[in-house]
Amino acid sequence: PLATIPVSTTSLTSSEGSTISTPSVDISTPVTTSIVGDQCSRCKNGGFWDGLKCQCLTPYYGESCEEVVNSIDIAPPETVSAQMELTVTVTSVKFTDELKNHSSQEFREFNKTFTEQMNIVYSGIPEYVGVNITNLRLGSVVVEHDVLLRTKYTPEYKTALDNATEVVKQKITKVTTEQIMTNDNCSALMCFNTTGTQVQNITVTQYDPVEECRQKAEEYEDYFLVEYRDQKPYCISPCESGFNASKNCNHGKCQMSQNGARCLCVTTETHWYSGEDCNQGTQKSHHHHHH
């Protein structure tokens, strides 16, 4: 048997003129029921009955998963990162085969000095996290390594990381130009071959709140948009209040449909309201317009 769903109805009229009951549980259309034990429920839009209530899929909610939420949780990462693949040539250390073995004492000592040197080079970059040697090879020592950058997520994170990568390039170019051998001696912590400095690749975290918002909104993707508050992105429909894109329904209720947001106008004992934004009130007894 179909479950009886209690519905409290307020008479609402859509801006197109039809009278609608809300919450909009469609009691005139037969709905496939999911029966669990002796419980059954009409869970629409892919929702399922958990024995107590409908568990709805995003972006739906309501007793029967028939309504569309006004906002969808999107979770940008706390931090975003960039990885720069660099190569430098160290001339103040001569290559030995032991350096190829990352568990050798030679590699550990080289890694310690190289890390100390790079920490000094990049000390003025707030996004700098550290370096990671990926490979050492002959020539004196060609050091393939990653420079790791990280920053807090903000809408401008790409600009911040792009700027940081530019500063990394400037600083590594400067140090490998200045710290060079003199008469086969190095007076710095490390010396370099100026021509051996190369940026191979830069990878930046890709996070697009608009894309996440659209994906989660599914068939409503054209009507949900991202607005920022305190540098945090919110995925909202025009029915969510308090944002620039919020729809003002005045004497009515905003409801999402597959054609977008619309206002369902209220009819009271004394007035009925109409218009796209439910802002045109007509007194029932006098048929007098209030604007």
Partner: nanobody
């Protein structure tokens, strides 16, 4: 665990000689780099004489012709022969080592250190 133990320091008159020794345990002299640094009161530590397993050697300009660095691989010991000593040679002398084949005079690039031995040149 690399351990370096210096000996041979002391008080000597200007023009005199001393031989410093550095006994190493933990790895052998056949690899890496070895050297002597010194630090005078109120001054930074500086390279005096350095040697690497590929034959590279370095002497500070102030000690060239007077000091000689050498090693005895069988005894795993490093030496610094100091002749014609001057008052300005007064300092704590440190033995340093690295498993890397270094070309650097910067003490921060050297990972293993002895406790130091005092050399005083005074009349």
């Amino acid at each position: 665990e690399v351990q370096l133990v210096e000996s041979g320091g002391g008080v000597v008159q200007p023009g005199g000689s001393l031989r410093l020794s550095c006994a190493a345990s933990g790895f052998t002299f056949s690899r890496g780099s070895w050297g002597w640094f010194r630090q005078a009161p109120g001054k930074e530590r500086e390279a005096v004489a350095l040697i690497s397993s590929d034959g590279w050697t370095f002497y500070a300009d102030s000690v060239k012709g007077r000091f000689t660095i050498s090693q005895d691989n069988s005894k795993n010991t490093l030496y610094l022969q100091m002749n014609s000593l001057r008052a300005e040679d007064t300092a704590v002398y440190y033995c340093a080592a690295s498993v890397l084949v270094l070309r650097t005079l910067n003490p921060k690039a050297w990972h293993h250190w002895g406790q130091g031995t005092m050399v005083t040149v005074s009349s």
